[in-house]
C-alpha cells in the first residue's frame, strides 16, 4: 500500500499520571508548592521545560491519500504518527508513589499509538474502472506504554499507576510510598 | 562546580564497622537522588545503594542488605554509608553518584574513598 | 559473574567506528531502560547515555545508544585515542531488585 504524505502539525501528548512523571500542575500554574503535600520536596524545585520538549510523546498530523494499486483516494485521509520519546523527567514531587523514581534506570516506555479508528475511503480507478468502497485503520491517538518483561516484539502494556509496597522492615507512610513495578503488569510483551 | 567528595574510606578488620561520608557542593542537594558505587581492585563497578529525598526511598544490593545502611542529611548536604560486619570482600573504592532525572543514569560521581578490609 | 554481559575487549583506529554490546534479559533491559558509562583510566565514571539513547549534555554526538529486546548497544563513530577507557552498561533488575552493570569493556584505540 503506498502512501503520499503530507506532515500538517504535530500535538504533544502528556503520559497520564502514574505512567510517567510529568509537571505538576501546581508548579505550571507557578503555586508554592507546601512542603508536607510533597513528601518532603523543597519549595524551591523549579521545572525545567526543556525536558518536557526533550521527552514528549508527539502527535505528527499526516494528511495523505490511500492507494491500492493504480487507485486512489478520493480525499486525503488525516492520521496520527507517534513520535518522540517518554523518558526522564526531573525529579518532581507528582513521582511519589508512583515508581521508584531515584533509581538510576527505571520502566522503558515507548510512545505509540493508543486507539485506532477505522474510516471508509472511496478509492478512484484509472480507465474508468467504477470506484471502489475501502475501510482503513488510522491511529486515532498516540500513548506513552510501558516496555514489558516478555517480548514476542507484538504488544506494548499499558502503565497504570504501580501498586505501592512498603519497603522492607519499614512501616509504610503515606507520603512517599516505595512502588515496585506491578508483576500484573509485566505478563504482555513488548 | 558540581562536586561530591567522600571521606571516611581506610584499613578495617572483618567483622568491624566503618562510616563512609560524601559531602556535596555546587548544586542543590536535594534535588539529587543519591547512591553509593563500589570498584574493587582492577574489577568492574558495582552498585551498592541508593536513597531518595528521604529514608522511605531505599534500596540495596543484595551483598550489602542487613549489613550496610545508606542515610543523608540534607541540613548538611551529605550523604553516608554505615558499614558493619565488613567483609574481605567489601574491600573496594567506593564512589558517591547522584541523579536528578528520574531513572536517568547516575550524571555525578566523586572521585572515591579506599575501603580496605584486611586481617 | 555479572547479570549484563559485555566484551571484556574491543579495539579500533581512529576515526573507525566501533561497537559495544551488552546482553541482558527480560528482566532488566527487556522492561528497564539502559545507561552506559565510561571510566576513564584512574578517573571516577561518568554518564556516557541514558534512557537507551540519550546524551547528557557535554557528550559529543560521536556516542550513540540503542537497545532492542534485552540487548543494547553503545557506538562509537570517529574514534579518538582519548575515547580509550573502560565502558560499562548498567539497568535495573527487577528480578534482583537491584542496579546491575555489565562487567565492562576495555576499548583499546590502535
Known amino acids: 500500500q503506498g502512501w503520499q504524505a503530507f506532515k500538517n502539525d504535530a500535538t504533544e501528548i502528556i503520559p497520564e499520571l502514574g505512567e510517567y512523571p510529568e509537571p505538576p500542575p501546581e508548579l505550571e500554574n507557578n503555586k508554592t508548592m507546601n512542603r508536607a503535600e510533597n513528601g518532603g520536596r523543597p519549595p524551591h524545585h523549579p521545572f525545567e521545560t526543556k525536558d518536557v520538549s526533550e521527552y514528549s510523546c508527539r502527535e505528527l498530523h499526516f494528511t495523505r491519500y490511500v492507494t491500492d494499486g493504480q487507485c486512489r483516494s478520493a480525499k486525503p485521509v488525516t492520521e496520527l504518527v507517534c513520535s518522540g520519546q517518554c523518558g526522564p523527567a526531573r525529579l518532581l514531587p507528582n513521582a511519589i508513589g508512583r515508581g521508584k523514581w531515584w533509581r538510576p534506570s527505571g520502566p522503558d516506555f515507548r510512545c505509540i499509538p493508543d486507539r485506532y479508528r477505522a474510516q471508509r475511503v472511496q478509492l478512484l480507478c484509472p480507465g474508468g474502472a467504477a470506484p471502489r468502497a475501502r475501510k482503513v485503520r488510522l491511529v486515532a491517538s498516540c500513548k506513552c506504554k510501558r516496555l514489558t518483561r516478555f517480548h514476542n516484539q507484538s504488544e506494548l502494556k499499558d502503565f497504570g499507576p504501580e501498586a505501592a509496597r512498603p519497603q522492607k522492615g519499614r512501616k509504610p507512610r503515606p507520603r512517599a510510598r516505595g512502588a515496585k513495578a506491578n508483576q500484573a503488569e509485566l505478563e504482555n510483551a513488548y | 562546580e558540581v562536586q561530591l567528595v567522600e571521606s571516611g574510606g581506610g584499613l578495617v578488620q572483618p567483622g568491624r564497622s566503618l562510616r563512609l561520608s560524601c559531602a556535596a557542593s555546587g548544586f542543590t542537594f536535594e534535588d539529587y537522588a543519591l547512591h553509593w558505587v563500589r570498584q574493587a581492585p582492577g574489577k568492574g563497578l558495582e552498585w551498592v545503594s541508593g536513597?531518595?529525598?528521604?529514608?522511605?526511598?531505599?534500596d540495596y544490593a543484595d551483598s550489602v542488605k542487613g549489613r550496610f545502611t545508606i542515610s543523608r542529611d540534607n541540613a548538611k548536604n551529605s550523604l553516608y554509608l554505615q558499614m558493619n560486619s565488613l567483609r574481605v570482600e567489601d574491600t573496594a573504592l567506593y564512589y558517591c553518584?547522584?541523579?536528578?532525572?528520574?531513572?536517568?543514569?547516575?550524571?555525578?560521581w566523586g572521585q572515591g574513598t579506599t575501603v580496605t578490609v584486611s586481617s | 559473574q555479572s547479570v549484563l554481559t559485555q566484551p571484556p575487549s574491543a579495539s579500533g583506529t581512529p576515526g573507525q567506528r566501533v561497537t559495544i554490546s551488552c546482553s541482558g534479559s527480560s528482566s532488566n533491559i527487556g522492561s528497564n531502560t539502559v545507561n552506559w558509562y565510561q571510566q576513564l583510566p584512574g578517573t571516577a565514571p561518568k554518564l556516557l547515555i541514558y534512557?537507551?539513547?540519550q546524551r547528557p549534555s557535554g557528550v559529543p554526538d560521536r556516542f550513540s545508544g540503542s537497545k532492542s529486546g534485552t540487548s543494547a548497544s553503545l557506538a562509537i563513530s570517529g574514534l579518538q585515542s582519548e575515547d580509550e577507557a573502560d565502558y560499562y552498561c548498567?539497568?535495573?533488575?527487577?528480578?534482583?531488585?537491584?542496579?546491575?552493570f555489565g562487567g565492562g569493556t576495555k576499548l583499546t584505540v590502535l
Open positions: 536513597i531518595g529525598w528521604d529514608d522511605d526511598m531505599i
Open positions: 534512557n537507551n539513547n
Open positions: 553518584a547522584g541523579n536528578n532525572r528520574g531513572y536517568g543514569g547516575l550524571d555525578v
Open positions: 548498567a539497568a535495573w533488575d527487577d528480578s534482583l531488585d537491584s542496579y546491575v
